[in-house]
């Protein structure tokens, strides 16, 4: 058993049929010694008396808010949550496996630049009685500070018969060094509580591996005289790290016909312009990627040819 | 470069950008099996990193690029030695046309651009690379190349910025 926060405790249980469970001793937080009784949740049934209560925690029915009283007055509470371990593996019932980039990916994180700011998100089908708490650090043995805000519900989607809820959190490394080569990964830890079930999820990454620039901005076309060619120009996104002579991007320019089956023409360039042939009813799209490190491409910025 | 002269920024930029491309094409190396054998290896803990105080940020480069260039040089020599060690020359064998061969040569090429014959910077002591057990080599290659990708990315940024702003 360990303390998650004040008066909230997590009991770690091996979860299998007829498991013996864990013996837990609760102590009433009071100077009183006599006349103390214990109850669980809303029930008025007295579970025991005395300053301590010993219980055998085996299942969710044994978890909940234990309260010690004296003469009708509440003295203190202890909320017991369960953390299940099945076949040596902690349960992951609360969050949905996003399966990207690999199986057992529950948390996904992205950064728009090298400033040390990043966003993580996760999915669940649970709509009520759900709380999240997020902590983060750079490295684990001698952790350096990363400050995370509160997790908020950022999107709701309907998937077949199910509703899916996306939560996200923003974090900022306290002393970020954008130009340095990271040697210690960022660690993100999410505590999830659904009713009386506790689970924790972690992710470990370097900022460089979760970079995804915003799409290029101010995408413009300039027809070239007496030609089907056009000059496409764009700019670095505002959110990208500066100076651009140091934090450089590379770009992919794509000409795509109306039909998805039509052949796509692609050009790669380090410049912020390119000359392409603009076909009728086609559109021109540009996306960006860090020039020197193959992290994610940005989403496309697009303009129609006409 | 040693003693304060300026490197051939544009040449360094071109070669460092080539190094980035090679480092990504060399990884993941197609081994004979999946990287099933996990386990942390000392070899990758000792790699030199370009850290915050090394002056490789735009301001540091403007003030005095020597500190940064020396750190980059140390790293290039370190990785060049790693790529020639048993980790990469032993079994499972890399094919003759593996990008690792080119990567190895390019690391040497860039380090020589930074430190021509006759000049000597204090080079960091290369840890003695005791031959890893053969079964550890694939995982080590994987880790070393991942680490090298990050190192050469920072080096390439440095040379790109230098070529754009510090070239005579």
């Amino acid at each position: 058993i360990w303390e998650l926060k004040k008066d909230v405790y997590v009991v770690e249980l091996d979860w299998y049929p007829d498991a013996p469970g864990e013996m837990v001793v609760l102590t009433c937080d009071t100077p009183e010694e006599d006349g103390i009784t214990w109850t669980l949740d809303q029930s008025s049934e007295v579970l025991g008396s005395g300053k301590t209560l010993t219980i055998q925690v085996k299942e969710f029915g044994d978890a909940g808010q234990y309260t010690c009283h004296k003469g009708g007055e509440v003295l203190s509470h202890s909320l017991l949550l369960l953390h299940k371990k099945e076949d040596g593996i902690w349960s992951t019932d609360i969050l949905k496996d996003q399966k990207e980039p690999k199986n057992k990916t529950f948390l996904r994180c992205e950064a728009k630049n090298y400033s040390g700011r990043f966003t993580c998100w996760w999915l669940t089908t649970i709509s009520t009685d759900l709380t999240f708490s997020v902590k983060s650090s750079r490295g684990s043995s001698d952790p350096q500070g990363v400050t995370c805000g509160a997790a908020t519900l950022s999107a709701e989607r309907v998937r077949g018969d199910n509703k899916e809820y996306e939560y996200s959190v923003e974090c900022q490394e306290d002393s970020a060094c954008p130009a340095a080569e990271e040697s210690l990964p960022i660690e993100v830890m999410v505590d999830a509580v659904h009713k009386l079930k506790y689970e924790n999820y972690t992710s470990s990454f370097f900022i460089r591996d979760i970079i995804k620039p915003d799409p290029p901005k101010n995408l413009q076309l300039k027809p070239l005289k007496n030609s089907r060619q056009v000059e496409v120009s764009w700019e670095y996104p505002d959110t990208w790290s500066t100076p651009h002579s140091y934090f450089s991007l590379t770009f992919c320019v794509q000409v795509q016909g109306k039909s998805k089956r039509e052949k796509k023409d692609r050009v790669f360039t380090d410049k912020t312009s390119a000359t392409v042939i603009c076909r009728k009813n086609a559109s021109i799209s540009v996306r960006a990627q860090d020039r020197y490190y193959s992290s994610s491409w940005s989403e496309w910025a697009s303009v129609p040819c006409s | 470069v040693p003693g304060g002269s300026s490197p051939a920024w544009t040449q360094c930029q071109q070669l460092s950008q080539k190094l980035c491309t090679l480092a990504w094409s060399a990884h993941p190396l197609v081994g004979h099996m999946d990287l099933r054998e996990e386990g942390d290896e000392e070899t990758t803990n000792d790699v030199p990193h370009i850290q915050c105080g090394d002056g490789c940020d735009p301001q540091g480069l403007r003030d005095n690029s020597q500190f940064c260039l020396q750190r980059i040089h140390q790293g290039l020599i370190f990785y060049e030695k790693l790529l020639g060690s048993d980790i990469f020359t032993g079994e499972p064998s890399l094919l003759p046309d593996s990008p690792v061969g080119q990567l190895h040569a390019s690391l040497l090429g860039l380090s020589q651009l930074l430190q021509p014959e006759g000049h000597h910077w204090e080079t960091q002591q290369i840890p003695s690379l005791s031959p890893s057990q053969p079964w550890q080599r694939l995982l080590l290659r994987f880790k070393i190349l991942r680490s090298l990708q990050a190192f050469v990315a920072v080096a390439a940024r440095v040379f790109a910025h230098g070529a754009a702003t510090l070239s005579p």
Epitope: - | M33, E37, K81, S85, G90, E91, P134, W135
Partner: antibody, heavy 115, light 107 residues
């Protein structure tokens, strides 16, 4: 074509030393290890050790430490093995071979130790 | 050291037979196992690498299987030219060790 060409047979007296060579051609000498293997007449194979021609790093079978010394010369793409304090137990065919999974083997050097 | 044990020591077969040669390691070597054939007065020749990977130029009738500590070299339809001694080798950890060999004879 890849070839490992080994030096010719040796007949030496007990207590003496011998140095045999293995010249590589057809590939970049520093790209792969050179292993040495011992085979006594009508018997199995024993790994002696290897040298990495890139950095002259060596790895020995404990059994052959003090007996075998592996060296290489990049300029001539040649690996060498010196055997010291020879006894009749050292009479065998000695093979040089590049990485096991490449199947480059020398033709063997026959060593006879006899007074 | 990892001990490699081969069986049988000698195998006498008729051309066209399918034969299996066994190799056992004293501890797990994953799939870091090599098979060699050595004909009389010749250097060993690699037949199989990493337990089951074929080698170009080696007839397809030679196949390898196994992982961990038990390995098999199979010869689909033995030919008179297949005579020789077959060795297995641990390529997993130092020192590299060889099996004692299986001698293949044609009746």
């Amino acid at each position: 074509e890849v070839q490992l060409q080994q030096s010719g047979p040796e007949l030496v007296k007990p207590g003496a030393s011998v140095k045999m060579s293995c010249k590589a051609s057809g590939y970049t000498f520093t790209r792969y290890l050179i292993h040495w293997v011992k085979q006594k007449p009508g018997q199995g194979l024993e790994w002696i050790g290897y040298i990495n021609p890139y950095n002259d790093g060596t790895k020995y079978n404990e059994k052959f430490k003090g007996k075998a010394t592996l060296t290489s010369d990049k300029s001539s793409s040649t690996a060498y093995m010196e055997l010291s304090s020879l006894t009749s137990e050292d009479s065998a065919v000695y093979y040089c071979t590049s990485n096991w999974d490449l199947d480059y083997w020398g033709q063997g050097t026959t060593l006879t130790v006899s007074s | 050291d990892i001990v490699m044990t081969q069986s049988p020591a000698t195998l006498s077969v008729t051309p066209g037979d399918r034969v299996s040669l066994s190799c056992r390691a004293s501890q797990s070597i994953s799939d870091y196992l090599y098979w060699y054939q050595q004909k009389s007065h010749e250097s060993p020749r690699l037949l199989i690498k990493f337990a089951s990977q074929s080698i170009s130029g080696i007839p397809s009738r030679f196949t390898g299987s196994g992982s961990g500590s038990d390995f098999t070299l199979s010869i689909d339809s033995v030919e008179p030219d297949d005579v020789g001694v077959f060795f297995c080798q641990n390529g997993h950890s130092f020192p590299f060790t060889f099996g004692g060999g299986t001698k293949l004879e044609i009746k």
